[in-house]
Amino acid sequence: TPEVWVQVQMEATELSSFTVHCGFLGPGSISLVTVSWGGPDGAGGTKLAVLHPELGTRQWAPARQARWETQSSISLALEDSGASSPFANTTFCCKFASFPEGSWESCGSLPPSSDPGLSAPPTPVPILRAD
C-alpha cells in the first residue's frame, strides 16, 4: 500500500522559519503534490504550494520556496509572519497524486515544545486518504 510521510522541522538558526518535508512511498510516478496547512486539501486546509513535474511549482506566503528533493519527495520552506493564522501549532498536509495509484494524503505537525532543529517523527499518519 502506498504511504505518504510528513516531517516538520523548525530551523535552528531562525525560530520563525520552518521546513516541511514530504515523501511518497510506493510505485508509480508522481503527477502532482499539494501542500496545505490547517487541514487536508479541500477539507478546510489552506493551500501552501503545488508542485508539478513538468509545469513547475507555485507557493503562497508564508511559504518561501517549494522544491523537489527527489522524484518522490519535496520540501517547503516557510516563514511565520504576516498570515492570519500562525503555524507553530498547525498541521501540515501533503497530498501526492500518482499514476496509477490515485491520491494519497498524510498530515504532520511540529512536536509540542520541540527544540530548534528537531523534527516530527518521519511517518506521522493522522490522515491517509485514497481518492
Epitope: 490547517g38 493551500k47 503545488v50 509545469l55 513547475g56 507555485r58 503562497w60 506566503a61 498570515a83
Partner: antibody
Framework: QVHLQQSGPDLVKPGVSVKISCKAS????????INWVKQRPGQGLEWIGW????????YYNEKFKGKATLTVDKSSSTAYMLLSSLTSEDSAVYFC????????????WGQGTTLTVSS | DIQMTQSPSSLSASLGGKVTITCKAN??????IAWYQYKPGKGPRLLIH???TLQPDIPSRFSGSGSGRDFSFSISNLEPEDIATYYC????????FGGGTKLEIK
C-alpha cells in the same frame, strides 16, 4: 467559463465603510485564492491581499492592514472586501482576481468596482 | 519587500513594428514574473506567466524572456488592438506590480 462579477460603482462620504463584492462562477470557488487589487486614477496597480476561500485564511499587504478586511461566503461563492474609515485616498477602482496556481497568477479578473469618496 | 522597476513608462510605435518593455526586480525572483494588458473599463488580461509561458488564448506575437532579476516582454507585428497599458507582476513572494507602460501607436 470562469467569471468574476463585481458589485457596481459606489459614491460614499469620508469616514464611512463600504463592502465590495465579487461573485465567482465557473470553477470550484474553494480551491483558488482570491486577490484584491487597487488602481488609483492615473496610477498603477497595487496588491491589497488575498483570501483562500476554502479556509478563510487571509494575507494582507502591510500597507492595507487595518484598511481592508477580506471575507468570503462559500455558500454563494462570493468574496468581499470591507474598506473602513474611508478618505479621498481610497477613491479608486478595485479589482478581484483569481490566482490560477500553475495556470498563472491572477488569471481571471472581475470588471472592477469604482469607489468615489467625496463629501 | 520585492520592488519592480518597469521601463519605459510610455512608448509609441508603428503598426507592424515591435516593442520591448523591461522589468527589473531588486532581488532574484527566479522566473516568477507575469505580464498583463490593461484597458480601462475591463479587468487586466493575463498574457504571460512564469516568464515566457503564453496563456492559451494569447497570440504568439507576444513573448517574454529573462531570469533572476531582469526580464523583458515584447510585442511584434503591432496591431491597433494592442493599444493599452502593460504591467509586469512578480509573484515569487507575495505580489508586486511594475509601474506600467502605456503603449501608443504612431
Amino acid at each position: 467559463q470562469v467569471h468574476l462579477q463585481q458589485s457596481g460603482p459606489d459614491l460614499v462620504k469620508p469616514g464611512v465603510s463600504v463592502k465590495i463584492s465579487c461573485k465567482a462562477s465557473g470553477y470550484t470557488f474553494t480551491d483558488y485564492y482570491i486577490n484584491w487589487v487597487k488602481q488609483r486614477p492615473g496610477q498603477g496597480l497595487e496588491w491589497i491581499g488575498w483570501i483562500f476561500p476554502g479556509s478563510g485564511t487571509t494575507y494582507y499587504n502591510e500597507k492595507f492592514k487595518g484598511k481592508a478586511t477580506l471575507t468570503v461566503d462559500k455558500s454563494s461563492s462570493t468574496a468581499y472586501m470591507l474598506l473602513s474609515s474611508l478618505t479621498s485616498e481610497d477613491s479608486a477602482v478595485y479589482f478581484c482576481a483569481r490566482d490560477g496556481g500553475l495556470r498563472g497568477p491572477f488569471d481571471y479578473w472581475g470588471q472592477g468596482t469604482t469607489l468615489t469618496v467625496s463629501s | 519587500d520585492i520592488q519592480m522597476t518597469q521601463s519605459p513608462s510610455s512608448l509609441s510605435a508603428s503598426l507592424g513594428g515591435k516593442v520591448t518593455i523591461t522589468c527589473k526586480a531588486n532581488q532574484d525572483i527566479n522566473k516568477y514574473i507575469a505580464w498583463y494588458q490593461y484597458k480601462p473599463g475591463k479587468g487586466p488580461r493575463l498574457l504571460i506567466h512564469y516568464t515566457s509561458t503564453l496563456q492559451p488564448d494569447i497570440p504568439s506575437r507576444f513573448s517574454g524572456s529573462g531570469s533572476g532579476r531582469d526580464f523583458s516582454f515584447s510585442i511584434s507585428n503591432l496591431e491597433p488592438e494592442d493599444i493599452a497599458t502593460y504591467y509586469c507582476l512578480q509573484y515569487d513572494y507575495l505580489y508586486t506590480f511594475g509601474g506600467g507602460t502605456k503603449l501608443e501607436i504612431k
